[in-house]
Interface confidence: medium
């Protein structure tokens, strides 16, 4: 029997192919075999099928990087990494996606899910769309909705100062942040660390964070697979 999706365009299609173990998979943008991309798939959280695009866990990877690095992506997909804005833009252009953020710290955990998530193209400076919050972490991403991405060498925020420079990270900064998941690992100084404001505030750097996405209609697709 052939695969349901010979060239899966995301982790949800990989899962619908029968792959149910979290790990590295190859996906194909728009199902095009010439646009292969290695991603880490979370196949367990809330039904699985998630492409993980950010992970912070130990501070070994440097996240204070320039525009070029954030556009392309960096790090080890099994460890700390950033998948890349170009990749995020292409993936979210394939259809309607949802965002999940998982946070953990000293045995505590929290999550945030946004029903509608997209990242614009390079021309928009990777403008963020994030709407429809639910979860336990608090709606901190709402503040960043509609913002373009900022790095220390490309300042697109609405502050007089350069937010990325001030807080040694990169994000869809406004003036400046409620979320700073690419901040300085372990830095509990105000607004400098790995922050999710409505969970742990700005003076606490969270130990573990993942951002991930999957199609908004995943549950419908999953149900269809089970019936089949």
């Amino acid at each position: 029997i052939g695969l349901l999706y010979p060239f899966p365009r995301d982790c949800s299609q990989a899962m619908l192919n029968g792959d149910t173990t979290s790990g590295l998979y190859t996906i194909y943008i728009n199902g095009d075999k010439t646009q292969a991309l290695e991603v880490y798939c979370d196949m367990t959280s809330d039904g699985g099928g998630w492409i993980v695009f950010l992970r912070r866990k130990n501070g070994r990877e440097d996240f204070y990087r320039n525009w070029k690095a954030y556009a392309a992506g960096f790090g080890d997909r099994r460890e700390e990494f950033w998948l890349g804005l170009d990749n995020l833009s292409k993936i979210t252009a394939q259809g309607q996606y949802e965002l999940r953020v998982d946070l953990q710290d000293h045995g505590e955990s929290a999550y945030a899910v946004y029903d509608r998530f997209s990242v614009g193209d390079a021309k928009s400076r990777y403008k963020l769309k994030v709407e429809g919050y639910s979860g336990t972490a608090g709606d901190s991403m709402n503040y960043h909705n509609g913002r373009s991405f900022s790095t220390y060498d490309k300042d697109t925020d609405s502050a007089i100062t350069n937010c990325a420079l001030s807080y040694k990270g990169a994000f869809w900064y406004k003036n400046c942040h409620r979320v700073n998941l690419m901040g300085r690992y372990g830095d509990n100084n105000h607004s400098q660390g790995v922050n999710w404001f409505h969970w742990k505030g700005h003076e606490y750097s969270i130990q573990f964070a993942e951002m991930k996405l999957r199609p908004s209609n995943f549950r419908n697709l999953e149900g269809r697979r089970k019936r089949a």
């Epitope: 502050a159 007089i160 406004k174 400046c176 607004s191």
Partner: antibody
Framework: QVQLVESGGGLVQPGRSLRLSCAAS????????MHWVRQAPGKGLEWVSG????????YYADSVKGRFTISRDNAKNSLYLQMNSLRAEDTALYYC?????????????WGQGTMVTVSS | DIQMTQSPASLPTPVGDRVTITCRAS??????LNWYQQKPGKAPKLLIY???NLETGVPSRFSGSGSGTDFTLTISSLQPEDFATYYC?????????FGQGTKVDIK
């Protein structure tokens, strides 16, 4: 154009209740958090309460917590403030204000206000 | 709660002069600071949001600056229609709190 119109104010005795309403028009109501801000005669501004666009999250100043309840009816583009156990110090002009993002908010549109006087 | 302290409380100023109003937060608030103008008998009006961004339709003689705990509202050349009370407000966290106001009147 974007407009907020408050109603429901008046003279009320201490311990009694009052319900304020705010009718919104000119914007997609359920996309925005909404708030109540008050101003006692001759005094400054005091934030009273806020509610998220969906109505799922509500926030209150300590001075009104347990006595006031904010709610909204997105189908009617309306915001409400149910005020119970009113005190003399609740006497103020109550403004309805549109937020720009949610909790910890900026108020970009204000109504003209409705006066609440608590006196025996 | 975050306390917002404005100074001065009153500022008699001639038309055409430069006006500077300061606002200090009791704790660090990044740039989550807004400025409002209120004229007698009227509702407040948003002038500046996020410390330095001019609200649509507000004249360019108004500007805002600052971050962290110290902020400033500047009117480069005071016009007759600018006589009003000005309030700062932190939008960093709930409860959102306002300064006590600065009344700019005719000297």
């Amino acid at each position: 154009q974007v407009q907020l119109v408050e109603s429901g104010g008046g003279l009320v005795q201490p311990g009694r209740s009052l319900r304020l309403s705010c009718a919104a028009s000119g914007f997609t109501f359920d996309d925005y958090a909404m708030h109540w801000v008050r101003q006692a005669p001759g005094k400054g501004l005091e934030w009273v309460s806020g509610i998220s666009g969906s109505g799922g999250s509500t926030y209150y100043a300590d001075s009104v917590k347990g006595r006031f309840t904010i709610s909204r009816d997105n189908a009617k583009n309306s915001l409400y403030l149910q005020m119970n156990s009113l005190r003399a110090e609740d006497t103020a002009l109550y403004y309805c204000a549109k937020g720009t993002r949610g909790e910890g908010d900026t108020f970009d549109i204000w109504g003209q206000g409705t006066m609440v006087t608590v006196s025996s | 709660d975050i306390q917002m302290t404005q100074s001065p409380a009153s500022l008699p100023t001639p038309v055409g002069d430069r006006v500077t109003i300061t606002c200090r937060a009791s704790q660090y608030i990044q740039g989550f600071l807004n400025w409002y103008q209120q004229k007698p008998g009227k509702a407040p009006k948003l002038l500046i949001y996020d410390a330095s961004n001019l609200e649509t339709g507000v004249p360019s003689r108004f500007s805002g600056s600052g971050s962290g705990t110290d902020f400033t509202l500047t009117i480069s050349s005071l016009q007759p229609e600018d006589f009003a009370t000005y309030y700062c407000q932190q939008s960093y966290s709930t409860p959102q709190t306002f300064g006590q106001g600065t009344k700019v009147d005719i000297k």
